[in-house]
């Protein structure tokens, strides 16, 4: 092992555990983590007599380094006396010494909170000729504290006579002020208020913040939703600017097209957020044909608080196309929620990631607020998937027990949509293509070709799936078969996944 100097710790008792009539008391010093032997421990007992005992060094199991304890027993007026333990480790260097000065016992205390406040800029957002830093040391058990100001870690020569202490109930607070020239403050140095109390150090630091920019303005430009593009046939794109600091300067958003052709009239909205920042959105209608043919649209953002203009561009996603597979299923009844049921829709393996998901009931599209749909996530392969969740009520399914999950995607043919119906009570459902969920089986229609079920939405079932005859203990209509997986070594009725 290489040479290692010791860490030194004072060992004291709690004051409340020492009897008031005690004539002598023992305190200690721990030197640990050093290598090689030896360390030399000496004590400064001031005006008091004391006897010392240094215990033999022990080896720390994991590191192979050493630890030792030196004990000092003093008698007399020890309560007001400070003691210094001096540890020397000559293998580290001939003058290596660590001193720890402490009293016989430690009192329970509430440590201070240290916080630096700084004077504000003038009305124009500029720094005044001098900057005041105020160090607030608050909420500590009354006792001696020392305040030191540091500049980039170096002690500053500061008049601390201005520090003032107040007491509120059982706790005390102190404040100290530091005045800096504008030049010092702008030089980007770090200023620290360091407080020493009960042998511990507490501190807070500050420096000039980055210039008057907010927390990084961000700009985003969305593509039109497939629903707007293919169903409503009135696509729009939105330029979103977030985290702007509200100020007199306005955000300037300018739209353009890479082809140089004119753009439509855009609509703009500004919103003040709870965190005090401003969000600006500008929505631009685009031509369906222009978009499909690959036009690039650009949104240029300028603002007094932005170092440079930001430009965001958007165009039709390039790359391979794949239509979505859609699977819809109902969750089983849950104890205590007989009048509500959750429907789920898994839409997967589509490319590109732009997709719109809708739910329909009674041929009417349900409001978007009714369902919750995840953002597209990448599958293990090259496509994307989303989940959509819809809560339905008994009143709805008793009126008509058929809910449709519809995906709108550019690769879906013939009309850019794929949809699947799902029922809360599949046994009572009508005959449209459905993917139903039983407690541990998937139901398939019996109208199969070459012994294969017409699984969810006509997709090919898992190669190891087949449709077995309906079981007597399965309360379904006779025209439904049970799709089971032929898993080796398992009963043929075990279902372990969507077929």
């Amino acid at each position: 092992a290489s040479t290692q100097s010791p860490s030194v710790f004072p060992l004291t008792r709690c004051c409340k555990n020492i009897p008031s009539n005690a004539t002598s008391v023992t305190l200690g010093c721990l030197a640990t983590g050093y290598f090689p032997e030896p360390v030399m421990v000496t004590w400064d007992t001031g005006s008091l007599n004391g006897t010392t005992m240094t215990l033999p060094a022990t080896t720390l199991t994991l590191s192979g380094h050493y630890a030792t304890i030196s004990l000092l027993t003093v008698s007399g007026a020890w309560a007001k006396q400070m003691f210094t333990c001096r540890v020397a480790h000559t293998p580290s260097s001939t003058d290596w010494v660590d001193n720890k000065t402490f009293s016989v016992c430690s009192r329970d205390f509430t440590p201070p909170t240290v916080k630096i406040l700084q004077s504000s800029c003038d009305g124009g957002g500029h720094f005044p000729p001098t900057i005041q830093l105020l160090c607030l040391v608050s909420g500590y058990t009354p006792g001696t504290i020392n305040i030191t100001w540091l500049e980039d870690g170096q002690v500053m020569d500061v008049d601390l006579s201005t520090a003032s202490t107040t007491q509120e109930g059982e706790l005390a607070s102190t404040q100290s002020e530091l005045t800096l020239s504008q030049k010092h403050w702008l030089s980007d140095r770090t200023y620290t208020c360091q407080v020493t109390y009960q042998g511990h150090t507490f501190e807070d630091s500050t420096k000039k913040c980055a210039d008057s920019n907010p927390r990084g303005v961000s700009a985003y430009l969305s593509r039109p939703s497939p629903f707007d593009l293919f169903i409503r046939k009135s696509p729009t794109i939105t330029c979103l600017v977030v985290d702007l600091a509200p100020s007199k300067g306005t955000v300037n958003l300018t739209w353009s097209r890479a082809s140089g052709k004119p753009v439509n009239h855009s609509t703009r909205k500004e919103e003040k957020q709870r965190n005090g920042t401003l969000t600006v959105t500008s929505t631009l209608p685009v031509g369906t044909r222009d978009w499909i043919e690959g036009e690039t649209y650009q949104c240029r953002v300028t603002h007094p608080h932005l170092p440079r203009a930001l430009m965001r561009s958007t165009t039709k996603t390039s790359g391979p196309r794949a239509a979505p597979e859609v699977y819809a299923f109902a969750t089983p009844e849950w104890p205590g929620s007989r009048d509500k049921r959750t429907l789920a829709c898994l839409i997967q393996n589509f490319m590109p990631e732009d997709i719109s998901v809708q739910w329909l009931h009674n041929e009417v599209q349900l409001p978007d607020a009714r369902h919750s749909t995840t953002q597209p996530r990448k599958t293990k392969g090259s496509g994307f998937f989303v989940f959509s969740r819809l809560e339905v009520t008994r009143a709805e399914w008793e009126q008509k027990d058929e809910f449709i999950c519809r995906a709108v995607h550019e690769a879906a043919s013939p009309s850019q949509t794929v949809q699947r119906a799902v029922s809360v009570n599949p046994g009572l459902a009508g005959g449209s293509a459905q993917s139903q969920r039983a407690p541990d089986r998937v139901l398939c229609h019996s109208g199969q070709q070459q012994g294969l079920p017409r699984a969810a939405g006509g997709s090919v079932p898992h190669p190891r799936c087949h449709c077995g005859a309906g079981r007597a203990d399965w309360p379904g209509p006779p025209e439904l078969d049970v799709c089971v997986e032929e898993a080796e070594g398992e009963a043929p009725w075990t279902w372990t996944g969507l077929c």
Epitope: P214, R215, G216, L306, R308, A309, R312
Partner: antibody, heavy 119, light 110 residues
Framework: QVQLVESGGGLVQPGGSLRLSCAAS????????MTWVRQAPGKGLEYVSI???????WYANWASGRFTISRDNSKNTVYLQIDSLRAEDTATYYC?????????????WGQGTLVTVSS | DIQMTQSPSSVSASVGDRVTITCQAS??????LAWYQQKPGQPPKLLIY???TLARGVPSRFSGSGSGTEYALTISSLQPEDFATYYC????????????FGGGTKVEIK
């Protein structure tokens, strides 16, 4: 065509000051954010400061306090004032124009002016 | 502040070689990554902006790619006039940034 011509460089003693100028022509200066970039001999490019079209400015952390960027659109000129010069400020200082549409980097650079700080 | 790390710092190649230079951002950036070419005694010249769009007059053998934190500049078939130093730049910072340039990659003749 777009032209940026820097001037004001030269030999200066440590602790001294310099004011670099950048004369712009061939485009409307007020439409562009402008940047100063420096390059020490044999070293890479180092961003110094930027001033946007509104006249607000930003500096690299190390440049705060000693460097001041400004612009006078009526004179088609951008300035960089450097105070308390140090040996490590020795570099070629380039005046550069940000692309108009933004987010796309610097499309035009001046030839640069050499600042040498030495006693 | 976002830091841009370029690698390698230098590369030796022959005319006709395919050369790829990478630039890594310390955090994800939107798309405003630019690439510059600089020859001795000259100012830098913009090659690529928006991480993949060729600047006017730049030969098609130069191409840019990448997203998020990883970006690359590729020269498909190195020409004699391509021996130079190349820099990437985070050109889209909407806030204070300390050094927006990568450290540079010198492409030398093998």
């Amino acid at each position: 065509q777009v032209q940026l011509v820097e001037s004001g460089g030269g030999l200066v003693q440590p602790g001294g000051s310099l004011r670099l100028s950048c004369a712009a022509s061939g485009f409307t200066l007020s439409n562009h954010d402008m940047t100063w970039v420096r390059q020490a001999p044999g070293k890479g490019l180092e961003y110094v400061s930027i001033i946007n079209t509104y006249g607000n400015h930003w500096y690299a952390n190390w440049a705060s306090g000693r460097f001041t960027i400004s612009r006078d659109n009526s004179k088609n000129t951008v300035y960089l004032q450097i105070d308390s010069l140090r040996a490590e400020d020795t570099a070629t200082y380039y005046c550069a124009r940000e692309t108009h549409h933004g987010s796309s980097g610097i499309d035009h650079w001046g030839q640069g002016t050499l600042v040498t700080v030495s006693s | 502040d976002i830091q841009m790390t370029q690698s390698p710092s230098s590369v030796s190649a022959s005319v006709g070689d395919r050369v790829t230079i990478t630039c890594q951002a310390s955090e994800s950036i939107y798309s405003g990554l630019a690439w510059y070419q600089q020859k001795p005694g000259q100012p830098p010249k913009l090659l690529i902006y928006d991480h993949r769009t060729l600047a006017r007059g730049v030969p098609s053998r130069f191409s840019g790619s990448g997203s998020g934190t990883e970006y690359a500049l590729t020269i498909s078939s190195l020409q004699p006039e391509d021996f130079a130093t190349y820099y990437c730049q985070h050109a889209d910072y909407a806030h204070h940034s300390d050094n927006v340039f990568g450290g540079g990659t010198k492409v030398e003749i093998k």
